[in-house]
Interface confidence: low
């Protein structure tokens, strides 16, 4: 019997939404604890099994009804008929005139219905249940408090959109207010609460109350079925009514992809697009940079075919024989870079002398990639995987305030390179094959040295005038440099062994470099050039009008260090005070850096020529480094 009573009470309580729709028994007990005394008799001070009010409800603020449990009639004790009496407060004081229920039928068994004639919305009521003249339960309320609208009707939904991934979709849920709610006249102002969940879930997701009869529901999972329900309450008073009938929402799969979890798909998407993008970029790279790819994979470095020197001597590392051959000048100096252990090299592929089949070495050199990343330390060379070729040291002397561009150091301006002149806007022999014929490529940063060297090192030279200018000199016409060939041409070799070099080719415009612009005093770059392929540093240069032919006198040094060998030929210089050196010779061709220093580093295959400085009136000198082509080397030796 007790179990039956418990189930009955729970059923009644569950059907009641007077308690704000809370589906937890604990919440119901707290909200209307008097309605469930039989469930937990300990909650009630007098816990005898007597009739109890379960709820009173007004669906539309015009009528209301009250319900109770008739427990006593199902027990052994019969207390007689149950009656409901009510009283209303017309003034501040309650009247003690109790009137019996006007309608025991209309609202069903164990209920009392108050139609509009008996309902005063603003006046509080007290009701009581009696049996055999004794009060068994008593409640007080205001009609406005017990408003519980009927459930919303006509629920439906429409698809708003589907996410780009096809995983989620947004829908719009619509409904209508209950028929008996006087919405139009404003007698009732309803707020709605929508709840939804996946069919297999137990917990409903509750949306914030709204005043409209439609609401978007976002981010529902596609290919899942959802249940949606709506309930309503009188705004600012009353309790939520019962929920509407459940609306089932099934979102069909709208993507060819199906995945268990959301986070799988984006990765798949990223991988697909990533692979596609890489493929496209690879093809673009292959087709647009064929020359540079060849340079990167098989760097074409000139074979040291020097007439008069057996290549086997170079291959076998017999440097002393090479020294003997080259040591034909009297101004040899026994200085040596024994402490420059950081000078690095590029291996020459001596075994393939016929590699140069399609284009000259100069072409290959000039088509090297100038767009490698800039770095202050250890920039990797495209040829050998080591840091780039020769790295002429920078003297710290002869710095003038005027020499330093805008007062900033080279290293501090890594971003100044973009859009400014590059000294090595090289004259590409095949302009059609190069995408760089219009603009100067980006240059490397200055002072490309190893980590243990944090400042420039002096270059052992004959005089103090062999100073690299470390300053930045702004180019007046950066674009005019784009067609300059910086390779000195070997025009003759004297019987005494002196090499006669002629200046490099003029630019395409047919002007000498100094004639390109009237006000253009110098050719320079913002930072020392560090070309990944062949050139590592090109300090600030100046246009120096000199005689077109310059005589080279070689000075040979013996090998003192097998680890780090320099076969140095002395710089081709004219005396600093030589008359006419600083004069401008109209129509004279612009001299280029002359390659007069041979470096053989760590192996007989490393053959590098350094450029040396030309004397300037103001003691500023040109300096560069790079390779001499085999064609030019062939002319050096008889």
């Amino acid at each position: 019997m007790d179990l039956w009573q418990l189930l009955l009470t729970l059923a009644l309580a569950g059907s009641s939404d007077a308690f704000s729709g809370s589906e937890a028994t604990a919440a119901i007990l707290s909200r209307a604890p008097w309605s469930l005394q039989s469930v937990n008799p300990g909650l009630k001070t007098n816990s005898s099994k007597e009739p109890k009010f379960t709820k009173c409800r007004s669906p539309e603020r015009e009528t209301f009804s009250c319900h109770w449990t008739d427990e006593v009639h199902h027990g052994t004790k019969n207390l007689g008929p149950i009656q409901l009496f009510y009283t209303r407060r017309n003034t501040q004081e309650w009247t003690q005139e109790w009137k019996e229920c006007p309608d025991y039928v209309s609202a069903g068994e164990n209920s009392c219905y108050f139609n509009s004639s008996f309902t005063s919305i603003w006046i509080p009521y007290c009701i009581k249940l009696t049996s055999n003249g004794g009060t068994v339960d008593e409640k007080c309320f205001s009609v406005d408090e017990i408003v519980q609208p009927d459930p919303p009707i006509a629920l439906n939904w429409t698809l708003l959109n589907v996410s780009l991934t096809g995983i989620h979709a947004d829908i719009q849920v619509r409904w209508e207010a209950p028929r008996n709610a006087d919405i139009q006249k404003g007698w009732m102002v309803l707020e709605y609460e929508l709840q939804y969940k996946e069919v297999n879930e137990t917990k409903w997701k509750m949306m914030d109350p709204i005043l409209t009869t439609s609401v978007p529901v976002y981010s529902l999972k596609v290919d899942k079925e959802y249940e949606v329900r709506v309930r309503s309450k009188q705004r600012n008073s009353g309790n939520y009514g019962e929920f509407s009938e459940v609306l089932y929402v099934t979102l069909p799969q709208m993507s060819q992809f199906t995945c268990e979890e959301d986070f799988y798909f984006p990765w798949l998407l990223i991988i697909i697009f990533g692979i596609f993008g890489l493929t496209v970029m690879l093809f673009v790279f292959l087709f647009s940079k064929q020359q540079r790819i060849k340079m990167l994979i098989l760097p074409p470095v000139p074979v040291p075919k020097i007439k008069g020197i057996d290549p086997d001597l170079l291959k076998e590392g017999k440097l002393e024989e090479v020294n003997t051959i080259l040591a034909i000048h009297d101004s040899y100096k026994p200085e040596f870079h024994s402490d420059d252990s950081w000078v690095e090299f590029i291996e020459l592929d001596i075994d393939e002398p016929d590699e140069k089949t399609e284009e000259s070495d100069t072409d290959r050199l000039l088509s090297s990639d100038h767009e490698k990343s800039h770095s202050n330390l250890g920039v990797k060379d495209g040829d050998s995987g080591r840091t780039s070729c020769c790295e002429p040291d920078i003297l710290e002397t002869d710095f003038n305030a005027n020499d330093i561009h805008e007062g900033t150091s080279e290293v501090a301006q890594p971003q100044r390179l973009k859009g400014e002149a590059d000294l090595l806007c090289l004259d590409q022999k095949n302009q059609n094959n190069s995408p760089y014929h219009d603009a100067c490529p980006a240059t490397q940063q200055p002072s490309v040295i190893q980590a243990e060297k944090n400042k420039p090192q002096p270059l052992p030279t004959e005089g103090a005038e062999s100073t690299h200018q470390a300053a930045h000199i702004q180019l007046s016409n950066p674009s005019s440099l784009s067609n300059i060939d910086f390779y000195a041409q070997v025009s003759d070799i004297t019987p005494a062994g002196s090499v006669v070099l002629s200046p490099g080719q003029k630019n395409k415009a047919g002007m000498s470099q100094c004639d390109m612009h009237p006000e253009m005093v110098s050719l320079c770059q913002e930072n020392f050039l560090m070309d990944n392929a062949y050139f590592c540093e090109a300090d600030a240069k100046k246009c120096i009008p000199v005689a077109p032919h310059i005589k080279v006198e070689s000075h040979i040094q013996p090998s003192l260090n097998q680890e780090d060998i320099y076969i140095t030929t002395e710089s081709l210089t004219t005396a600093a005070g030589r008359p006419g050196t600083g004069e401008h010779v109209p129509g004279s061709e612009m001299p280029v850096p002359d390659y007069t220093s041979i470096h053989i580093v760590q192996s007989p295959q490393g053959l590098i020529l350094n450029a040396t400085a030309l004397p300037l009136p103001d003691k500023e000198f040109l300096s560069s480094c790079g390779y001499v082509s085999t064609d030019q080397l062939n002319k050096i030796m008889p």
Epitope: A18, A26, A27, S30, S142
Partner: antibody, heavy 124, light 108 residues
């Protein structure tokens, strides 16, 4: 005018008992809910107990359950809080308050009228 | 039991400022939330009930709102008499009533 006047507070030793009274005027306790709320010195509000005298329903905070008893005498329009086994942590100002609106509503726990409070000090 | 976490615990504001105090319920309490104002040595006063309903006699600069389990009390333009401690309260759940820790609004 609605008024609530508490009495019965004072100093008591731990383990002792006190009975607080709340005399109501301007409204009928029979048709209202009465709550006891306390506030320890320098602390926040803490609900203690409630009674809905027309149904006899009572409810207590966990911290006082089994030690405190709330009741009402409708003939005297007065509510009571019997406090037994008092502890030092029960030291507080005890307020008697009336629940706003009555049953059936969200508002049955909202308190619209408060008494001036009575201090209960539990100390040895 | 439903817990009410109130923030901030204190705030400094000037007259005319807009002040917002938030209470977060540990579980859904529908709209069964009230807000009170208490001045030192005085009993609390009801400001808001049912989360957003203004109690009679309370100035309209006070307002309440609800967003899920977050409840907010807003004072649109702080007045000198508004410097006090404010409490939120829920009255739904197995422990019928619980209060927030309180927010003290002080003069900046």
């Amino acid at each position: 005018e609605v008024q609530l006047v508490e009495s019965g507070g004072g100093l008591v030793q731990p383990g002792g008992s006190l009975r607080l009274s709340c005399a109501a005027s301007g409204f009928n306790v029979s048709y209202s809910s009465i709550h006891w709320v306390r506030q320890a010195p320098g602390k926040g509000l803490e609900w203690v107990a409630s009674i809905y005298s027309y149904s006899g329903y009572t409810s207590y905070a966990d911290s006082v359950k089994g030690r405190f008893t709330i009741s009402a005498d409708t003939s005297k329009n007065t509510a009571y809080l019997q406090m037994n086994s008092l502890r030092a942590e029960d030291t507080a100002v005890y307020y008697c308050a009336r629940g706003y609106m009555y049953w059936w509503s969200y508002y049955n726990g909202a308190i619209d009228y408060w008494g001036q409070g009575t201090l209960v000090t539990v100390s040895s | 039991d439903i817990q009410m976490t109130q923030s901030p615990s204190s705030l400094s504001a000037s007259v005319g400022d807009r002040v917002t105090i938030t209470c977060r319920a540990s579980q859904s309490v529908s709209s069964a939330v009230a807000w009170y104002q208490q001045k030192p040595g005085k009993a609390p006063k009801l400001l808001i009930y049912s989360a957003s309903s203004l109690y009679s006699g309370v100035p309209s600069r006070f307002s309440g709102s609800r967003s899920g389990t977050d409840f907010t009390l807003t004072i649109s333009s702080l007045q000198p008499e508004d410097f006090a401690t404010y409490y939120c309260q829920q009255y739904e759940g197995s422990s019928l009533i619980t209060f927030g820790q309180g927010t003290k609004v002080e003069i900046k």
